[in-house]
């Protein structure tokens, strides 16, 4: 399910008549927040709900990739009465709720970040007691996760008549730019494929073809730093063979 | 009392883009949420997307790339567009009232007769 | 997304009969189940909603009941008028429909 608007619903009145006004279902997220891979980031999310002082069971769930639909990554629990909210599940436990679900506020921190990390989260509370009632976020809270370059495979393989290609890959956000250098090449983009599909923070350059023996290196860089990784080609003139 | 009506094309070309109206009256689109619900002939139920009460919208995963609601408030109308439609679209559209009143969703209370589309070149 | 699974998918029974539909849900849907009838050519009627509450209106010998995945509606003695399609329908995460229950007479 997919949602157009930023999630900030006022705390509109209800326009039935009533004899006092009742709050509205809204929850109020921001649209994005940032942090860096290994940092924590805190995911706010507030809600307004009709049931006057609801003390009844009520569980916080925090969801990831859509909303009503996307697994969960963060569940928790708390009895009639309680302002304790029972952890029932945390992925690989790195989620854990900062705020007071009784007090309208489901935010979420998020420990040790990593890039996988970087998606769309969603807040949902449901009450369970005398009042059976559910809401969730529908747009929900983008986690940019930003960070620096790193080098995740450098290689050398061989092509098609003797010939021998270099490939890297490097991950990072903003996805990184990646320049080859070695001997006869000086900086070279050479062939830069990014990003992979289903693989939004990785990025490959491609040599195609090493033409002399010697070290070629590979820079990946973006505006959080740079990272570099090298690969030596070594060819035994006369043999097909080659040493890397 | 509480009614909706759908309207629109009969017979749709395909690859064409038509748009279906829901009319409706005896309550508020300010109040109430209006989804849309589709059903080929002689199979089941799909749900496709809801107007909610605030003029936000959620679509059916599945459709999202070809779906667009959209609502005129003055004349209690909600639109639903459909991008290049196919023989497979050819079913009766209905639209719904979600029976909550206070911004949270619950099931569809009241429909309209529905209004038969037939994709065919 | 929550999927529903409706059995059997065809019944034969008669007047008179106590009939039971089946709805499975491959998550816990929380009792926010509903069930609709709809006949040829007419749109869906909401019968129960919440898994067992009757919409104004509607006979009382349909009945709903269940919990957690697995849900059912009764007809305590069927009548020729309630020979229909039958759905079930979850709005707990999102909005699915069953692929629906063709109740006819023997």
């Known amino acids: 399910f997919v949602r157009t608007k930023i999630d900030t619903t006022e705390n509109l009145l209800n326009t039935e008549v009533h004899s006092s006004p009742a709050q509205r279902w809204s929850m109020q997220v921001p649209p994005e927040v940032s942090a860096e891979a290994g940092d924590a980031a805190v995911l706010p999310c507030t809600f307004t709900h009709p049931h006057r002082h609801y003390d009844g069971p009520l569980t916080a769930i925090w969801r990831a990739g859509e909303p009503y639909a996307g697994p969960q990554v963060f569940r928790c629990a708390a009895a009639r009465g309680s302002e304790l909210c029972q952890t029932a599940l945390s992925l690989h436990g790195r989620f854990r709720l900062l705020g007071n679900p009784r007090r309208n506020d489901l935010s979420l921190r998020v420990e040790r970040l990593a890039l996988a990390d970087d998606r769309r989260y969603f807040c949902r509370v449901e009450f369970a007691g005398d009042v059976h009632d559910r809401y969730e976020s529908r747009h929900g809270v983008r986690l940019h996760v930003t960070a620096a370059p790193r080098i995740v495979n450098i290689s050398v393989l061989p092509s098609p008549a003797h010939a021998f290609r270099a490939l890297c890959t490097a991950e990072g956000e903003p996805p990184p730019a990646l320049a080859w250098s070695g001997p006869a090449l000086g900086n070279s983009l050479a062939a830069v494929r990014s990003p992979r599909e289903g693989h939004g923070h990785l990025v490959t350059a491609e040599l195609p073809a090493l033409t002399h023996d010697g070290r070629y290196t590979c820079t990946a860089a973006n505006s959080l730093g740079r990272s570099e990784a090298s690969v030596y080609l070594f060819r035994f003139h006369g043999a097909s063979g080659a040493s890397t | 009392q509480v009614q909706l009506k759908e309207s629109g094309p009969g017979l749709v070309q395909p690859s064409q883009t038509p748009s279906l109206t829901c009319t409706v009256s005896?309550?508020?689109?300010?109040?109430?949420?209006v989804h849309w619900v589709r059903q080929p002939p002689g199979k089941g139920l799909e749900w496709m997307g809801v107007m909610w009460s605030d003029g936000d919208t959620s679509y059916n995963s599945a459709l999202k790339s070809r779906l667009s609601i959209s609502r005129d408030t003055s004349k209690s109308q909600v639109f639903l567009k459909m991008k290049s439609l196919q023989t497979e679209d050819t079913a009766t559209y209905y639209c719904?009232?979600?029976?909550?009143?206070?911004?949270?969703?619950?099931?569809?209370?009241?429909w309209g007769q529905g209004v038969m589309v037939t994709v065919s070149s | 997304n929550i999927q529903l699974t409706q059995s059997p998918s065809l019944l034969s029974a008669s007047v008179g009969d106590r009939v039971t539909l089946s709805c499975k849900g491959s998550?816990?849907?929380?009792?926010?189940l509903a069930w609709y009838q709809q006949k040829v050519g007419e749109a869906p009627k909401l019968l129960i909603y919440n898994t067992d509450s009757l919409q104004t209106g509607i006979p009382s010998r349909f009945s709903g009941s269940g919990s957690g995945t697995d849900y059912s509606l009764t007809i305590s003695s069927l009548q020729p008028e309630d020979v229909a399609s039958y759905f079930c329908?979850?709005?707990?995460?999102?909005?699915?429909f069953g692929g629906g229950t063709n109740l006819e007479l023997k």
């Open positions: 719904a009232r979600d029976h909550q009143d206070n911004g949270g969703y619950a099931h569809f209370d009241f």
């Open positions: 998550q816990n849907i929380n009792n926010y």
């Open positions: 005896g309550f508020s689109l300010t109040t109430y949420h």
């Open positions: 329908f979850q709005y707990n995460s999102g909005w699915t």
